[in-house]
Interface confidence: low
């Protein structure tokens, strides 16, 4: 009589996460009797998976009817695989008996899990930084499996190359995860700009993950400052206006001084945007030139974004002619008395 | 969608022949054992033939070397092939599907009538 | 061949009411146990499978227990839509035999 052999057919299996995996395994024969049994790992740890027996095996399920007479295949279907099911599995086969004696094992297969990446999180730093400094984004995707993967950078679709890139754990695991830092430059002009990390994996069938971070979350682009005067109709009264020019995020507040003095303080309200994404602002006030002493003069201070405060100065010019239309009693503030004393827009 | 779909029902008189057919739509017949089923009217259920994935084929009693059970799995279908027919075997025809590890029937057709008289 | 045995053959019951159908086969056929509904001149449905596992879209009030040669089927409150004719099966080996079926009617 032949001896038995138990056939497992395959060394190895892939199987994407999510899915079934099928487990071949034959007998060469039914005799003697006695159950099937499949196991994980080798050895007194190993993991019972399925007893055809008894027990209750809610993903495991064999592929054809063990029941039915001259049924040798003990092929077994794990559903929904996860990563953790990795390892090799064995179909062995035991004596009936009291307690049922282990006769053969079959070979052994390896079944290895194909685990998609999640989703990559790309988060940018916590502060922002101005035009010329250089921001570091940081890109993460976990759960993947096998651990070959590949992750590009890309600014505004260009691809970057000063970047970092991490898969741990260094040795086998059920998965794994990613971890890519990149270097970015900023220039004035990135404040619509966006960092694009792009995740490859062979479960992904060439449609790669792709995580973004828009660059106005860490860009700080500051003001320029102008301040001008222009002559108003009434010839004892001059417009002195503060121009508040691309700038990047909106919040700012701007203080007028006179002669180092504070005047009057604004927040920044009704901005125009500049079509690169910067904003520009200004602000005004009306000079009463009879009013004024030799030497006046008035400083836009604007803080921008909690930062140090940036300024600009202007010596208020008063023509002779403006003078001659002051009467001599004339005195009181150089700042026009109505209410508002500046304006904007 | 997984899907049985029978044909071939019809009046027969007895002595005659009929083939009924059973198209799947959704799965692939051949990696599944596959039935037919019968009921007649106001009675309950029997099972009739089965054909596993290795072509085995089974039988119940009263249709042994009358009937013959077949697929064609290039056209995805089942076959029942109906000879010496007799008025016991009026009823509806049920087309099953075997779960793919235990055999326990997870999927039916609508069923397709079969009388036989003269 | 094994024969199975279900009672009651018929069962009348409310709607709300919890009701237990019965099946018994006349060898041990392990856990390959399976129950069907079938309404007037319909197909019928697969609900449980190897005793007490149910086939996916069939709701949880359905349960089934037993092992070797006695068999339940509960539904657990009954609803309009659960008014039918149940039936038992064994297939763990052929030929596969059904139950003589047990009419669930309103009451």
């Known amino acids: 009589e032949e001896e038995l052999q138990v056939i497992q057919p395959e060394k190895s299996v892939s199987v994407t996460a999510g899915e079934s995996a099928t487990l071949n395994c034959t007998v060469t024969s039914l005799i003697p009797v006695g159950p099937i049994q499949w196991f994980r790992g080798a050895g007194p740890g190993r993991e019972l998976i399925y007893n055809l027996k008894e027990g209750h095996f809610p993903r495991v399920t064999t592929v054809l009817d063990p029941t039915k007479r001259n049924n040798m295949d003990f092929s077994i279907h794990i559903s929904n695989i996860t990563p953790a099911d990795a390892g090799t599995y064995y179909c062995v086969k035991f004596r009936k008996g009291s307690p049922d004696v282990e006769l053969k094992s079959g070979a052994g297969t390896e079944l290895s899990v194909r685990a998609k990446p999640s989703a990559p999180v790309v988060s940018g730093p916590t502060a922002r930084a101005t035009p010329e400094h250089t921001v570091s984004f940081t890109c993460e995707s976990h759960g993947f499996s096998p651990r070959d993967i590949t992750l590009k950078w890309f600014k505004n679709g260009n691809e970057l190359s000063d970047f970092q890139t991490n898969v741990d754990p260094a040795g086998k695991s059920v998965s794994y995860s990613i971890r890519s830092t990149a270097r970015v430059v900023l220039t004035r002009r990135d404040v619509h700009s966006q960092v694009i990390c792009e995740v490859a994996h062979v479960t992904l069938q060439g449609d790669p993950l792709r995580g973004t971070a828009n660059l106005s979350e860490a860009i700080r682009v500051p003001p320029t400052l102008e301040v001008f005067q222009r002559p108003m109709r009434a010839e004892n009264q001059v417009n002195v206006t503060c121009q508040v020019r691309k700038f990047y995020p909106q919040r700012l507040l701007l203080t007028w001084l006179e002669n180092g003095n504070v005047s009057q303080t604004e927040t920044a309200s009704t901005l125009t945007e500049n079509k690169d994404g910067t904003y520009n602002w200004r602000s005004w006030l009306l000079v009463n030139t009879c009013a004024h002493r030799d030497g006046v003069v008035l400083t836009c201070q604007v803080e921008h974004d909690g930062q140090p405060a940036v300024s600009k100065s202007h010596a208020l010019e008063v023509s002779a002619h403006q003078k001659e239309q002051c009467s001599d009693t004339t005195s009181g503030p150089v700042l026009a008395p109505t209410a508002p004393l500046g304006g904007s827009g | 969608e997984v899907q049985l779909v029978e044909s071939g029902g019809g009046l027969v008189q007895p002595g005659g022949s009929l083939r009924l057919s059973c198209a799947a739509s959704?799965?692939?017949?051949?990696?599944?054992?596959m039935h037919w089923v019968r009921q007649a009217t106001g009675k309950g259920l029997e099972w009739v033939s089965a054909?596993?994935?290795?072509?085995?084929?089974y039988y119940t009693g009263s249709v042994k070397g009358r009937f013959t059970i077949s697929r064609e799995n290039a056209k995805n279908s089942l076959y029942l092939q109906m000879n010496s027919l007799r008025a016991s075997d009026t009823a509806v025809y049920y087309c099953?599907?075997?779960?793919?590890?235990?055999?326990?029937?997870?999927?039916w057709g609508q069923g397709t009538m079969v009388t036989v008289s003269s | 061949d094994i024969q199975m045995t279900q009672s009651p053959s018929s069962l009348s019951a409310s709607v709300g009411d919890r009701v237990t159908i019965t099946c018994r086969a006349s060898?041990?056929?392990?856990?390959?146990l399976a129950w069907f509904q079938q309404k007037p001149g319909k197909a019928p449905k697969s609900l449980i499978y190897?005793?007490?596992s149910l086939h996916s879209g069939v709701p949880s009030k359905f349960s089934g227990s037993g092992s070797g040669t006695d068999f339940t089927l509960t539904i657990s409150s009954l609803q309009p839509e659960d008014f039918a004719t149940y039936y038992c099966q064994q297939y763990v080996s052929y030929p596969y035999t059904f139950g003589q079926g047990t009419k669930l009617e309103i009451k």
């Open positions: 060898q041990d056929i392990n856990n390959y």
């Open positions: 054909i596993g994935t290795a072509g085995d084929t």
């Open positions: 099953v599907r075997g779960g793919v590890w235990d055999d326990a029937f997870d999927i």
């Open positions: 190897t005793a007490s």
């Open positions: 959704g799965f692939t017949l051949s990696s599944y054992d």
